[in-house]
Amino acid sequence: TPEVWVQVQMEATELSSFTVHCGFLGPGSISLVTVSWGGPDGAGGTKLAVLHPELGTRQWAPARQARWETQSSISLALEDSGASSPFANTTFCCKFASFPEGSWESCGSLPPSSDPGLSAPPTPVPILRADLAGILGLSGVLLFGCGYLLHLLRRQKHRPTPRLQPSHTNSQALTAQAWAPSQASQAALHDPYATINTSFCPATLDTAHPNGWASLPTHAAHQPQGPAASASTPILARGSFVSVENGLYTQAGERPPHTGPGLTLFPDCRGPRAVEGRFGVR
């Protein structure tokens, strides 16, 4: 049976930065991924991002960057603006959907060991001191190197210099070859999926499952629904709807783009879910 794993990481250098990694283990193609926090989608959770394999992503604060890592895994960077980090004790949920086959959802949270409240995190000051020590150390090595070179040059002055014999060797053969990254390595360094609202090509993805990413299929929910999908084109965020008691859709005032989807079927509306399909509308 398909399984969803979730891993939450806190950035070592920035205590306010978190990254949620989610992956789908199972056959079939994923048509949409939804990431929410505070609980599963549609059950008290608040939507953070929706990722489509071809059409890109939509995200809402505090999500900073959502991207595909492989055909079946995604990552979401979060920026916590608050002084006290609410992410530390928060549950993050990822839902992988394949229309009309079904959807699978799992939740996870930051491991207790990495909770800033439980283990004293490195403060910015020691980090700066460590950097300073590195700079000073490097400076010392360079100064010592320069002194040593001067010493060698002085010794060289006092020695008789041997005469160089003329050579028929082509001077070009003695030219040093400049080092530069190859096209292949440059291409490897470029990540086409690092930006938001980007599309991705499943055929080109080959990123391996990172070592040590634990599978956490807690609260796994499977919605069997009964086969696959395809689509393409750019993103366009739409207007807004607000929930009304027993109202299906009720239109509200304009909302700035990407502030969140706005169609609510019923009260207490938060969180998302998604899959795929294409309307040939002109």
């Epitope: 939804t34 059409l55 919605q223 509306c269 294409r278």
Partner: nanobody, 121 residues
Framework: DVQLVESGGGSVQAGGSLRLSCVAS????????MGWFRQAPGKEHEGVAH???????RYVDSVKGRFTISQDHAKNTLYLQMNSLKPEDSATYYC???????????????WGQGTQVTVSS
């Protein structure tokens, strides 16, 4: 969790009509659009029609002028009135709620079990 229950499917002769209904209940997730998808055996699924946040109905070219999508807020129900049915309209029809990625695309977030529509010539 959300429940979308379709009804109204059945068998009909070419040129006939059917009205599909979808009742939404226990839905607590904000979405951008609600509509109908269909899938015929051995074929890719396709979006038939949807209503998005601007309230304007949108249709796939093959059903324009024949199908009408509408909703009843009081009953939390979505409808698809299908007239002048053709054999190629035969498929399982799914009611979906989802997210907009562009004007003519509603990415299903939740969907029902589907209702079968068979049109004989």
């Amino acid at each position: 969790d959300v429940q979308l229950v379709e009804s109204g499917g059945g068998s009909v002769q070419a040129g006939g009509s059917l009205r599909l209904s979808c009742v939404a209940s226990r839905y607590t997730s904000r979405t951008d659009c609600m509509g109908w998808f269909r899938q015929a055996p051995g074929k890719e699924h396709e979006g038939v029609a949807h209503i998005d946040s601007d309230g304007i109905p949108r249709y796939v070219d093959s059903v324009k002028g024949r199908f009408t999508i509408s909703q009843d807020h009081a009953k939390n129900t979505l409808y698809l009135q299908m007239n002048s049915l053709k054999p190629e309209d035969s498929a399982t029809y799914y009611c979906v709620v989802g997210f907009k990625f562009d004007d003519d695309y509603c990415a299903p977030n939740d969907w029902g079990q589907g209702t079968q529509v068979t049109v004989s010539s």
